[in-house]
């Protein structure tokens, strides 16, 4: 049975193979019930959470998770050593940095310990499941009377990330947005000195080091405006 994993934003992410072992019987057995889908996300390549919907089970069940890396030196089956719980029932597993190998095929197996033949296996490309932390330390530089430059930092290898900048003024009804490559800077060439501006940024592990669909959270906004630009005409950074 082939299925497609959907990330929380609805984008197709990677295909996964499910291997269900069913009992050869005419009556419907517990082992024919599908196990919940496992969703894994690698947070800034610091840790990974693999979670499932524990409430989809017909009765509360402490499902167990095993994992390994396909065709690699790390192909030894590992037990989850740090379970996540929802109402005292296992609902996920957290793996630490040393257990994450981005560029090897990650195999995750969910199993019902009461029905060992009831199991499902998925294969995931972890480099497509990285979610970076939100950009930090937003700063604005006034390059000229009408030009602003926005800079920010990421707690990750900068060349691996692309960015999305949104900005608006106090007169606007909607954000204007601009994609930015790995250079993590953005210039606004024409600034109206009578308006206040707000900027925010988010980042994604794409396209140089992976093909993640999921963006980071938005940075804290930074504001710039006519009544503050006089304080320091060349640098102004104010977080909300």
């Amino acid at each position: 049975l082939n299925t497609t994993i959907l990330t929380p934003n609805g984008n197709e992410d990677t295909t996964a193979d499910f291997f269900l072992t069913t009992m050869p019987t005419d009556s419907l057995s517990v082992s024919t019930l599908p196990l919940p889908e496992v969703q894994c996300f690698v947070f800034n390549v610091e840790y990974m959470n693999c979670t499932w919907n524990s409430s989809s089970e017909p009765q509360p069940t402490n499902l167990t998770l095993h994992y390994w890396y396909k065709n690699s030196d790390n192909d030894k089956v590992q037990k989850c050593s740090h379970y996540l719980f929802s109402e005292e029932i296992t609902s996920g597993c957290q793996l630490q940095k040393k257990e994450i190998h981005l560029y090897q095929t990650f195999v995750v197996q969910l199993q019902d310990p009461r029905e060992p033949r009831r199991q499902a296996t998925q294969m995931l490309k972890l480099q497509n499941l990285v979610i970076p932390w939100a950009p930090e330390n937003l700063t604005l530089h006034k390059l000229s009377e009408s030009q602003l430059e926005l800079n920010w930092n990421n707690r990750f290898l900068n060349h691996c990330l692309e960015h999305l900048v949104q900005y608006r003024t106090d007169w606007d009804h909607s954000w204007t947005e601009q994609s930015v490559d790995y250079r993590h800077k953005f210039s606004l060439p024409s600034v109206d000195g009578q308006k206040r501006y707000t900027f925010r940024v988010r980042s994604r592990f794409n396209p140089l080091c992976g093909s993640a669909q999921h963006w980071s959270e938005w940075s804290h906004p930074i504001h710039w405006g006519s009544n503050t630009s006089k304080e320091n005409p060349f640098l102004f950074a104010l977080e909300a």
Partner: antibody, heavy 116, light 108 residues
Framework: EVQLVESGGGVVRPGGSLRLSCAAS????????MSWVRQAPGKGLEWISS????????DYADSVKGRFTISRDNAKNSLFLQMSSLRAEDTALYHC?????????WGQGTLVTVSS | DIQMTQSPSSLSASVGDRVTITCRAS??????LNWYQQKPGKAPKLLIY???SLQSGVPSRFSGSGSGTDFTLTISSLQPEDFATYYC??????????FGQGTRLEIK
């Protein structure tokens, strides 16, 4: 003439789901981010969610995060709000509005009642 | 989250009166403030944006002022159609967008 017409409201049991729609006309839909704002009976206005012009990013109030999903179809000039795990406190008139943080145009609203 | 507090919660006035409604933010919101009017059974209507800019089609008797934390909506000469509930709304730090609790303007 600008028009925003909401539909999809109704009576639903706690824990249930509803999908609200908003049909827009009279303005260039994809020039605007869009939002949902609700108003409980006899109460004030509460912002629920906003989505940007191309549908690529959305923001939610904490009270609905993880339960409601905003989306849009620019080809059909339509805005949607998928609501799940509904609670009694979600009972309100739901307005769609143009803009992400300044609401230039509003619909008359569609009433959602969550009751057992 | 930024809290918006309007005062008074309700007021009575007569046609021709000058009326002022105030809105206070729990922290500075620069000029990211909008004002709306809502009549019973109707959708809200944008009156003022960016604290002091009059929305197209809104009569000039409406005006807004203020910056930072304190804002006012003024109706210079009250007309019969102005009796309604008025809301302020901040968009400085979002999400969330927050509204004031409303000011109900009634006929004396």
């Amino acid at each position: 003439e600008v028009q925003l017409v909401e539909s999809g409201g109704g009576v639903v049991r706690p824990g249930g789901s509803l999908r609200l729609s908003c049909a827009a006309s009279g303005f260039t839909f994809d020039d605007y981010g869009m939002s949902w704002v609700r108003q409980a009976p006899g109460k004030g206005l509460e912002w629920i969610s906003s989505i940007n012009r191309n549908g690529g990013s959305a923001d939610y109030a904490d009270s609905v995060k993880g339960r409601f999903t905003i989306s849009r179809d620019n080809a059909k000039n339509s805005l949607f709000l998928q609501m799940s795990s509904l609670r009694a406190e979600d009972t309100a008139l739901y307005h769609c509005a143009s803009g992400e943080f300044r609401f230039d145009y509003w619909g008359q609203g569609t009433l959602v009642t969550v009751s057992s | 989250d930024i809290q918006m507090t309007q005062s008074p919660s309700s007021l009575s006035a007569s046609v021709g009166d000058r009326v002022t409604i105030t809105c206070r933010a729990s922290q500075s919101i620069s000029s990211y403030l909008n004002w709306y009017q809502q009549k019973p059974g109707k959708a809200p209507k944008l009156l003022i944006y960016a604290a002091s800019s009059l929305q197209s089609g809104v009569p000039s008797r409406f005006s807004g002022s203020g910056s930072g934390t304190d804002f006012t909506l003024t109706i210079s000469s009250l007309q019969p159609e102005d009796f309604a509930t008025y809301y302020c709304q901040q968009s400085y730090s979002t999400p969330p967008i927050t509204f004031g609790q409303g000011t109900r303007l009634e006929i004396k």
